[in-house]
């Protein structure tokens, strides 16, 4: 009986569309599959980034696979047939590997490329983003930023820099409909007539970068000769209540008392009479429910609470 | 493709202590929040501890508050629970969990193979 | 805390039948809630986020429905593959988990 052989799938490629690091590896059936007719062939794809300790492996029907990569690298992909062991009366046949790599040839030396990117998404409605010109550049480099997440066409440039010394230095984007909770992919690259700049691309995903708006509305509650119960109110905009975490500071007669993470608008505090006064701050942060990480907002105005009547209701300034 | 591997995990004495690690490959480990998920033998999943990517946010379950520690070294790719004070109902496999994050939701889109503690003297 | 309630807790039925489980939350959780399958020896795995919404690679015969306190999970037509206990999860506050639904073959 004859051994069982399949070749490997034709023409493996990956395809780069212009998004910024969202390629596409795609193949062609194996030549030879007359034999197999009545079966489903399989193909079991791997790929990673050039350096990655980890292959991704996906096993698929289609001709086709979609992901991002790290154009800072350069990417290999492997791709193989398989026959199910239905198809062959016994155990699962495989092809040999077709291999294939992609990179985009670098330009300038790496400290060309701009220095300390920062992303921030204000308050889940402005995305801003800033960074250093590279090391030993020229007053006449300037740096381009472009930027695609699924959804748009095509990538889009910057076209609200922010600038010093009349170079780019930062973008302010424009309103980024339906944005969150995918990849959102940056390059930025420059020109300079002194040298060739180095690019640099960026993945990220905004639900994770943003930074609210403090707390308003500080208020202080009497519960009992030795409660006080701290309150505030959400920030303003679009971020639901039930994805904030705090952080409250309080200092009693200028002493920093408590220091306390909580995730709702209230805190209670037990007091003393000897109080004399009592003040805090708040600041808010997405929390794990709606994304996997946050940046702390700034610290909310002070609210303060004076005076020797502690029996008061409701304290508010 | 996504792994997520604990150890740690055996028997220990009641009010002893215990370390359990989660080594995670195949995805950027410092893009995740992650989190502990246990179950007790023949019974149902109970959530224990969460921690956002960065390390800097953490959560935890009443029932382990104050004994547990979360803690990840995104450097190794790796989540920790410190667990002290063990109590016999703490008796249970325990999962590493990836979140994965839709409109303002979460849910746990793969998890580890488990590791077994067992509290008894 | 949420309390996540399933019912029935356990359930048998057969190859090609269609089984329907519900979870009841404590108080309203929107459209917060997930469905997991368990095998025997094995971690869950994610069937259906944010109360309808299937997980990429999981069977269409899948569904989930509801909102507010009640939920569903249907198996269209059970496959063998299928036996397994299932567990509802909600994610309004904390992390709950209903105790979970044994489904056997009849």
């Known amino acids: 009986d004859t051994e069982i052989k399949v070749n490997p799938p034709q023409d493996f490629e990956i395809v780069d569309p212009g998004y910024l690091g969202y390629l596409y590896l795609q193949w062609q059936p194996p030549l030879s599959l007359d034999h197999f007719k009545e079966c489903t062939v399989e193909y079991e794809l791997k790929y990673r980034n050039i350096g990655s300790e980890t292959w991704k492996t996906i096993i698929t029907k289609n001709l086709h696979y979609k992901d991002g990569f790290d154009l800072n690298k350069g990417i290999e992909a492997k791709i193989h047939t398989l026959l199910p062991w239905q198809c062959t009366n016994g155990s699962e046949v495989q092809s040999s590997w077709a291999e294939t790599t992609y990179w985009i040839s670098p330009q300038g030396i790496p400290e060309t490329k701009v220095q300390d990117m920062d992303c921030v998404y204000y308050n889940w409605q402005y995305l801003l983003c800033s960074w250093k010109p590279g090391i030993g550049v020229l007053l006449d480099t300037n740096y381009n930023l472009f930027y695609w997440y699924e959804g748009l066409d095509h990538a889009l440039q910057c076209v609200d820099y922010i600038k010093a010394d009349g170079q780019n230095i930062g973008c302010r984007f424009p309103y980024l409909e339906a944005s969150d909770y995918k990849d959102f992919y940056i390059c930025v690259n420059g020109s300079s007539e002194n040298k060739p700049i180095r690019s640099s691309y960026f993945t990220f995903q905004l639900q994770n970068i943003v930074k609210p708006l403090p707390p308003v509305y500080l208020t202080f509650t009497r519960e009992s000769s030795c409660e006080i119960k701290l309150k505030w109110s959400i920030p303003l905009g679009p971020i639901p209540a039930r994805c904030f975490d705090y952080e409250i500071e309080i200092r009693e007669d200028d002493t920093t008392l408590v220091t306390a993470t909580v995730e709702n608008e209230t805190y209670t505090l037990k007091t003393t009479n000897e109080t004399r006064q009592l003040c805090f701050v708040v600041r808010s942060k997405v929390n794990i429910y709606c994304s996997d990480d946050g940046i702390w907002s700034e610290w909310s105005d002070k609210q303060c609470w004076e005076g020797e009547d502690l029996s008061k209701k409701t304290l508010l300034r | 493709e996504v792994q997520l591997l604990e150890s740690g995990g055996g028997l220990v004495q009641p009010g002893g202590s215990l370390r359990l690690s989660c080594a995670a490959s195949?995805?950027?480990?410092?893009?995740?929040?992650m989190s502990w998920v246990r179950q007790a033998p023949g019974k149902g999943l109970e959530w224990v501890s969460a921690i956002s990517g960065s390390g800097g946010s953490t959560y935890y379950a009443d029932s382990v508050k104050g004994r547990f520690t979360i803690s990840r070294d995104n450097s190794k790719n790796t989540l920790y629970l410190q667990m002290n004070s063990l109590r016999a109902e703490d008796t249970a496999v325990y999962y590493c969990a990836r979140y994965g994050h839709y409109a303002y939701g979460s849910y746990f889109d793969y998890w580890g193979q488990g590791t077994l503690v067992t509290v008894s003297s | 805390d949420i309390q996540m309630t399933q019912s029935p807790s356990s359930l048998s039925a057969s190859v090609g039948d269609r089984v329907t489980i519900t979870c009841r939350a404590s108080?309203?959780?929107?459209?917060?809630l997930n469905w997991y399958q368990q095998k025997p020896g094995k971690a869950p795995k994610l069937l259906i986020y944010a109360a309808s919404s299937l997980q990429s690679g999981v069977p269409s015969r899948f569904s989930g429905s509801g909102s507010g306190t009640d939920f569903t999970l249907t198996i269209s037509s059970l496959q063998p593959e299928d036996f397994a206990t299932y567990y509802c999860q909600q994610d309004y506050y904390l992390f709950t988990f209903g105790q979970g639904t044994k489904l056997e073959i009849k």
């Open positions: 195949g995805f950027t480990f410092s893009s995740y929040a």
């Open positions: 108080q309203s959780i929107s459209s917060y």
